[in-house]
């Protein structure tokens, strides 16, 4: 089911189909004996009563007040009255712009970055099943696609994407043909959204252990959705079974980033585990970024000066 | 330029296996440490000289291996779970990553 039509300001182009729908709906079906009203305001008539009588082009169904279509003279207050509940509407009808194929004022834009995803589907819900075709234009000239009751296009953006797109749902209604265009302006911009990947914290670490017990070494970065945290070691170390890596844990930062964190646990420490450097490594497409863990024998921490010390 | 080419997903019931190939080409593939990754969080490595390393939710149950001769890296994964279900790339470990390839998919079902 169509949403109902919750904005209080709404701007429109003449000559296109329009609708307003309240939002006690699934209420007001309850309570079918209910009296519904709609009203129109504007300038000097105060709340006119709304009703096909009034114009040829206004019906009224279900929850929705249609134009057939919506001309400059509608523009005013709309009003819809159920028992104690009210809605109100503010529509400023605007001029079409008869030199092109959608008017600036109705245009939303949108930036997309350089090969990223990039889609723009055409679709209308509430006028669906009166849709005849849908056409979609760049820059007014028509675009040749497969689907002509959805065109679409899904594909990794590049600079030549950027223009304006024009939906235009071709549909009829009482004998009468009408259009409506919905635009989009997409600016394709340079990949804006990488960071270098950082690895969180000093980047010499010993560590003292005991032998014989455990010992869990924690890495984190801040890095790309792309990018990738593991621990590196010594190609001897590969094969020693008490050297666990275990699970990332990821979490989006507000800014769209990742917070990784992982963890490489050494059971049973002994000795071929003493003094050999375990690096985290974050890498990216642009390079690495690591930090060294070293484990040195509590009994050794007195050679080694405090603030390199990681507890 | 790198390109890695990953193949050999696919659907398979938990505890069935299946063979990962990852074909390299444009790298000094038999000097890198190369590694598997579900989605990006590496799973298995191998050093040049056939030393591996795994993690623990995958360790005893994959196997990774390579054939420096064809530029060429394996991952036989046996006893999958649905847990393992993912898109599988390989890449390179240790330096900068190359870009991803496309990837393979594989599904296990319970």
């Known amino acids: 089911a169509e949403s109902c039509t919750s904005r209080p300001h709404i701007t429109v182009v003449e000559g296109e189909p329009f609708y307003l729908k309240h939002c006690s709906c699934s209420l007001a079906h309850e309570i079918e004996t209910t009296t519904k009203s709609w009203y129109k305001s504007s300038g000097s008539q105060e709340h006119v009563e709304l009703n096909p009588r009034s114009s040829s082009r206004i019906a009224l169904h279900d929850c929705v007040l249609e134009f057939w279509p919506v001309e400059l003279n509608d523009t005013g207050s709309y009003f819809f009255q159920m028992k104690n509940y009210t809605q109100k509407w503010k529509l400023n009808v605007i001029r079409r712009n008869k030199h092109s194929c959608f008017t600036e004022r109705q245009v939303t834009s949108k930036i997309v970055e350089v090969k990223k995803f990039f889609q723009i589907t055409c679709e209308n819900s509430y006028y669906q099943t009166l849709v005849n075709s849908t056409s979609l234009y760049k820059n007014c000239k028509k675009l040749l696609l497969e689907n002509n009751k959805n065109p679409t296009i899904k594909k990794n953006a590049e600079f030549e994407d950027q223009g304006y797109y024009s939906c235009v749902h071709f549909l009829h209604h009482n004998g009468k043909l009408f259009n409506i265009t919905k635009t989009f302006n997409i600016t394709i911009v340079e990949d804006r959204s990488n960071i270098v990947p950082v690895l969180l914290g000093p980047k010499l670490n010993h560590v003292a252990v005991e032998l014989g017990k455990n010992v869990r070494l924690n890495c984190s970065a801040l890095l790309n959705e792309e990018d990738v945290i593991y621990w590196m070691f010594g190609e001897e170390n590969g094969s020693d079974p008490n050297i666990h890596e275990e699970k990332e844990m990821r979490i989006m930062t507000p800014e769209g980033k990742w917070h990784a964190s992982k963890v490489l646990r050494i059971e049973n420490i002994g000795e071929s585990n003493l003094n050999v450097l375990y690096n985290c490594t974050v890498a990216s497409t642009g390079g690495t970024d690591t930090k060294s863990f070293i484990l040195v024998r509590k009994a050794d921490m007195a050679d080694i000066p405090g603030h390199v010390f990681t507890r | 330029e790198v390109q890695l080419v990953e193949s050999g997903g696919g659907l398979v019931q938990a505890g069935g296996s299946l063979r990962l190939s990852c074909a390299v080409s444009g790298s000094a593939f038999s000097r890198n440490v190369m590694g598997w990754y579900r989605q990006r969080d590496l799973v298995a490595r191998i050093w040049p000289g056939g030393g591996t390393f795994y993690a623990d939710s995958v360790k005893g149950r994959f196997t990774i291996s390579r054939d420096n001769a064809k530029n060429t890296l394996y991952l036989q994964m046996n006893g999958l779970k649905p847990d393992d279900t993912a898109v599988y790339y390989c890449?390179?470990?240790?330096?900068?990553?190359?870009?991803w390839g496309q990837g393979t998919q594989v599904t296990v079902s319970s």
């Open positions: 890449n390179t470990v240790g330096i900068p990553l190359n870009a």
